[in-house]
């Protein structure tokens, strides 16, 4: 798996560099996760034809993947820093169960899947430090998550492959929209 941000040999070799600001650290962390997703998508797309499939709607009905909408305050029209930050953190917390589902879905990229999951946990911690209104953040119910995980794992092979593809695609889009907004803060 790739080395987490801030721990690569370049960083060690350049101790005179300014430490990263909180915003830079978050930016770097998201880009690191996006790299991980890219590697996982490569394996998924090579293994099956899901990336070209037009039957996504069939599987999407079973999933309630977080998505960025205008009301969330993360787009330029109606941009609201605090509302947006709450949406980003809430969305990432909701994605955690889906990232857990991904853990046994990869053969050659098992470590990469773990790295994406762990890096997301770190990202959530970074963002929680940035948020002023932590009370507005709703944490998913563990019981609901456990039953969702069981349900997803009980799907047939085709649906499991499709679910994997959809989770990766949606998570990528969510992170891209999140970082777009965070770069305005």
């Amino acid at each position: 798996a790739p080395v987490p941000p801030g721990e690569d040999s370049k960083d060690v070799a350049a101790p005179h560099r300014q430490p990263l600001t909180s915003s830079e650290r978050i930016d770097k962390q998201i880009r690191y996760i996006l790299d991980g997703i890219s590697a996982l998508r490569k394996e998924t797309c090579n293994k099956s034809n899901m990336c070209e499939s037009s039957k996504e709607a069939l599987a999407e009905n079973n999933l309630n993947l977080p998505k960025m909408a205008e009301k969330d305050g993360c787009f330029q029209s109606g941009f609201n820093e605090e509302t947006c930050l709450v949406k980003i953190i809430t969305g990432l917390l909701e994605f955690e169960v889906y990232l857990e589902y991904l853990q046994n879905r990869f053969e050659s990229s098992e470590e990469q899947a773990r790295a994406v999951q762990m890096s997301t946990k770190v990202l959530i911690q970074f963002l929680q430090k940035k948020a002023k209104n932590l009370d507005a953040i709703t944490t998913p119910d563990p019981t609901t998550n456990a039953s969702l995980l069981t349900k997803l794992q009980a799907q047939n092979q085709w649906l499991q492959d499709m679910t994997t593809h959809l989770i990766l695609r949606s998570f990528k889009e969510f992170l891209q929209s999140s970082l777009r907004a965070l770069r305005q803060m």
């Epitope: 880009r31 996006l34 205008e70 787009f75 330029q76 891209q176 777009r180 770069r183 305005q184």
Partner: nanobody, 124 residues
């Protein structure tokens, strides 16, 4: 990195319109966030507008908001900048830029591919 090619620049009178296009041969064009920057003579290059992988997610510089519209057509590997109500101060070389992370933003450092630029001149 992808090759970017701008077109559609030219000379126009104040109050007129112009549409810039930026095309790439990249196979994964839809994965890129795309932007327009501009550089007026003797000035620094500045952000104009950008568009995420989701076409609804656009950002504009305050100076062009309401006059310029950025859009993309993934089937044609092309982004557009529709410029209306042009002003002499819009005169500049307009550059197209791409971010392979699909994120974008208002800073030049976020972009890893750049076009050669298209000259836009607005006469009064």
């Amino acid at each position: 990195q992808v090759q970017l090619q701008e077109s559609g620049g030219g000379l126009v009178q104040a109050g007129g319109s112009l549409r810039l296009s930026c095309t790439t041969s990249g196979r994964t064009f839809s994965d890129y966030a795309m932007a327009w920057f501009r550089q007026a003579p003797g000035k620094d290059r500045e952000f104009v507008a950008d568009i995420g992988t989701n076409s609804e997610n656009t950002w504009y510089a305050e100076s062009v908001k309401g006059r310029f519209t950025i859009s993309r057509d993934n089937t044609k590997n092309t982004i557009y900048l529709q410029m209306n109500s042009l002003k002499p101060e819009d005169t500049a070389v307009y550059y197209c830029a791409a971010d392979s992370y699909g994120v974008g933003g208002g800073k030049q450092e976020y972009y890893d591919s750049w076009g050669q630029g298209a000259q836009v001149t607005v006469s009064s």
